[in-house]
């Protein structure tokens, strides 16, 4: 429970007062307001929304609300020269063309400035050639193609289904395989849940629906032209040839009606197994090229998008802390959308808006949080987390000294089944305690806690009676705060039943059909799940900003470090002969983890006993907690990924969305049996064990008694 002592406020102004002020009806109203027109990054419409949010946050009572602008590289289709893909015959005539735009949803037929589906940052080009179907274009899919099936993608146009991994990883894999173009499509197996109708009659993807998205491989760099530094007025920009993370081959997304027309003619090899088959009525032949009758036909891409340096705007609101104004708790989520943003991001932005309103109401009644709370409406998240990253680069010195925690607030829902939380282990106990105090919105759990319904529906694979909490990966605005700066971070949203719905994300993700009506009719008519997410996100911010002792439990880090060390050791032990030959030992890592466990335990004991009325000792203990996450940062970063600096967690090298533990060791071990120089490869494994062991030991020592 929060204490009120430090901020001299009446008992009324506690967590309960904050939570009771949050209203589902307000979230609904805000969502409607934010979703009536597109708010694409870099457009006038999104600038106007930034100014509206700035104005409303001021009205709600924040101390200051400023716009922070940057000039970053964005990507747009050419309005007069549309992107499309053709099937061409031997004479070069286009006998089939993919669609130029999605059929607009009912009621939106006359809306202007709906950007047609495109892969942001695709280079221009008109490659033509034979098609190869590459399943999800994952690392293992290309291994299957190249190593097992002996199929060469060099000089081919590959077609890959969306899902399983971040689309940028698919494009990177295709490039490395030598492809000269990539077609991405949504297969009904992944984006059409059985027994549900297509939009507008249900929440499934219609055949003309297409997923937009960027295809960068930024690895945390932010603006591709100014890696490491803010894209401000005096920025030095790289040339486009030196830009970070840009794809080198044309890429374009299509829906399943168009995919059907491309895939139905495929010849060549049969799919290797059933995991390569989707739900279309096509053979899912791998190719290369079309079958017999159509073997002279080719596929041609026509991509004319342009990359442009464009101004973007973050909104930054401040609620100054009464006791520790130099300690920052940040709640941030993005504002830019691909089209209407009914779920992504405005279901999150509407929740942030209501959280700001509730905090503002308390402030107007005389309350202040103990610590400063910063609220952020990020721009250009969809173009590579650009707004949040540029702001963090500009303010990195303040953040690394003063940043207590970052809570992310993108989409509040991706389903309506149960809670989903990804966070640092430091926040596990905070999340558990908070959800025990909140009511479950789920049917069949009336009068029960959110913790109870969450644990029942999404149990922890390791600890009975506890809910699953996942590792942080990336693909959202917490990335720079956690992976680069080492600020304790977390995110929460309502999700689907992963057991019964094995499609990727939600079906209408990044399509024109992500509307207000999608949410209001099909996902959350009462906005009760949105309200619950507001309570979780807002409650976390409240506790982090207001509790006298920071609600971090370092013992939970000790538990996961042991688990991650066991896991990486077992991966390495798949090569017992090489471990012996090259004298690979994990003793240093296990020793460091043991030391961390003991020191964390002693620190926790001291935390129970120290004199909380002594502000110096209190600040000292809190600083040790705040800086623990920072202690896992290696200033040199991970190999070839300088902006991923957290030694315990990084986005997977094979899927940006997923988190990997001990990523340095993991990557060194990955596919090690295929390395041309095993001695060098195992040497790198040993180096990464050394880095990890040192970092864990160093982090442990930050929790030791200071003198």
């Amino acid at each position: 429970k929060s204490s009120n002592e430090a901020t001299n406020i009446t008992p009324k102004h506690n967590m309960k007062a904050f939570l009771d002020e949050l209203k589902a009806e307000n979230i609904k109203k805000f969502l409607y307001n934010f979703t009536q027109i597109p708010h694409l990054a870099g457009t006038e419409q999104n600038f106007q929304l930034a100014k509206q949010i700035q104005s409303q946050w001021k009205e709600f009572g924040l101390d200051s609300v400023e716009l922070a602008h940057y000039d970053v590289l964005l990507s747009y289709p050419n309005k007069t020269h549309p992107n499309y893909i053709s099937i061409i015959n031997e004479d070069g005539n286009e006998i089939f063309n993919t669609s130029l735009f999605e059929p607009p949803p009912p009621g939106y037929e006359n809306v202007s400035d709906i950007v047609p589906p495109f892969s942001a940052f695709s280079p221009q080009g008109m490659p033509e050639g034979d098609l190869v179907y590459v399943n999800y274009a994952r690392t293992e899919d290309f291994f299957k193609l190249e190593r097992d099936m002996k199929i060469n993608c060099s000089g081919k146009i590959v077609i890959a289904r969306y899902g399983k991994v971040f689309r940028g990883n698919k494009v990177k894999n295709a490039q490395l395989a030598g492809a000269k173009g990539v077609i991405l499509y949504s297969d009904p197996a992944d984006y059409f849940a059985p027994g549900v109708k297509s939009y507008p009659d249900g929440w499934n993807l219609p055949g003309g629906g297409v997923q937009r998205g960027n295809i960068l491989n930024l690895n945390g760099a932010g603006d591709p032209l100014t890696p490491g530094y803010p894209a401000n007025e005096y920025a030095y920009r790289r040339g486009i040839a030196e830009a970070v993370g840009l794809p080198s081959i044309p890429v374009h997304p299509i829906g399943y009606y168009d995919a059907q027309k491309l895939l139905e003619k495929m010849g060549g090899s049969a799919p290797p197994d059933s995991s390569w088959r989707g739900s279309l009525k096509v053979p899912y032949n791998v190719g290369p090229g079309f079958t017999g009758n159509f073997s002279t036909q080719k596929v041609k891409m026509h991509i004319h998008s342009t990359n442009e340096v464009t101004r973007i705007y973050n909104v930054i609101g401040t609620l100054r802390g009464a006791v520790e104004p130099d300690r920052y708790v940040i709640l941030g989520g993005h504002r830019d959308s691909w089209v209407f943003g009914g779920i992504d991001p405005q279901s999150g932005a509407a929740v942030v808006h209501e959280i700001v309103r509730s905090f503002g109401t308390l402030k107007k009644e005389g309350w202040r949080p103990r610590r400063t709370i910063l609220f952020a409406s990020w721009d250009a998240e969809e173009f590579g987390l650009l707004g949040s990253t540029e702001w963090a680069e500009e303010n990195s010195r303040l953040l690394q000294e003063r940043g207590v925690a970052y809570i992310n607030a993108d989409s509040s829902i991706e389903g309506n089944y149960t809670l989903r939380v990804d966070c640092t282990p430091l926040m596990y106990s905070l999340v558990h305690n908070l959800t025990k105090e909140l009511k479950s919105p789920d049917e069949g759990f009336e009068g029960k806690s959110l913790y109870e319904s969450w644990t029942k529906k999404s149990p922890s694979p390791e600890f009975s009676g506890m809910p699953r909490i996942s590792k942080l990966g990336s693909g959202n605005d917490f990335e720079v705060f956690f992976q680069r700066l080492g600020i304790a971070s977390g995110r929460a949203r309502y999700t689907k039943n992963w057991e019964t719905n094995k499609f990727s994300g939600y079906p209408l993700y990044h399509s024109v059909y992500e509307t207000y009506e999608l949410v209001e009719k099909f996902y959350d008519p009462m906005f009760k799940y949105h309200l619950t997410v507001a309570q979780v996100r807002g409650g976390m911010v409240f506790e982090l900003a207001n509790s006298i002792v920071l609600p971090f439990d370092c013992r939970d880090y000790a538990v996961v470090l042991r688990k991650y060390a066991d896991k990486i050791y077992s991966i390495s032990m798949k090569h017992p002969q090489e471990m012996k030959t090259y004298s690979v030992s994990f003793d240093s890592l296990f020793s460091a983890v043991k030391n961390f466990t003991e020191i964390a335990s002693k620190f926790s004991e001291r935390l129970q006993d120290f004199d909380k009325s002594n502000p110096i000792v209190l600040r000292m203990m809190n600083d040790q907690l705040m800086f623990l996450e920072r202690a896992f940062i290696d200033p040199l970063g991970l190999p070839d990924r300088p902006f991923y600096r957290h030694v315990i967690y990084a986005p997977s090298s094979h899927n940006k969305y997923a988190g990997e533990s001990f990523p340095g060791i993991y990557d060194a071990l990955f596919d090690i049996e295929s390395k041309v120089d095993p001695s060098k490869a195992w040497g790198e494994v040993k180096r990464q064990i050394y880095v990890a062991a040192f970092t864990v030991q160093a982090a442990a020592e930050t929790l030791s008694e200071v003198a």
Epitope: T98, S99, P103, P106, E109, G207, K261
Partner: nanobody
């Protein structure tokens, strides 16, 4: 009320041109593929042409290929059929018909028809 209204028919000499229009109301033309279908006197229905909702693909019956052009103006909620080099065998009532599937890439079943406009090709 959902309806399609054809216009532009008439009597024309062989070798001349005619342009048919089809005005849609009560539904958004922009979301649907559209067809022209004809019925010659005493004969069954013949499909003539199809255009996808976005205009990216056009398909024609072999008998009209190279002579007829289907087009659309989604902003005006109107479908067109430009008929050149008309022949006596093109004499028919011409109907526009809405495809039933949103976003279809090839002709499917029709679910809304116009009342038709008569084209007579005669010297």
């Amino acid at each position: 009320e959902v309806q399609l209204v054809e216009s532009g028919g008439g009597v024309v000499q062989p070798g001349r041109s005619l342009r048919l229009s089809c005005a849609a109301s009560g539904f958004p033309l922009i979301s649907y593929g559209m067809n022209w279908v004809r019925q010659a006197p005493g004969k069954g229905l013949d499909w003539v042409a199809f255009i996808t909702y976005d205009g990216s693909n056009r398909y024609y019956a072999d008998s009209v290929k190279g002579r007829f052009t289907i087009s659309r103006d989604n902003s005006k909620n109107t479908l067109y059929l430009q008929m050149n080099s008309l022949r006596p065998e093109d004499t028919a009532v011409y109907y526009c018909a809405k495809d039933r599937i949103v976003g279809a890439r090839v002709p499917d079943a029709y679910d809304i028809w116009g009342q038709g406009t008569l084209v007579t090709v005669s010297s």
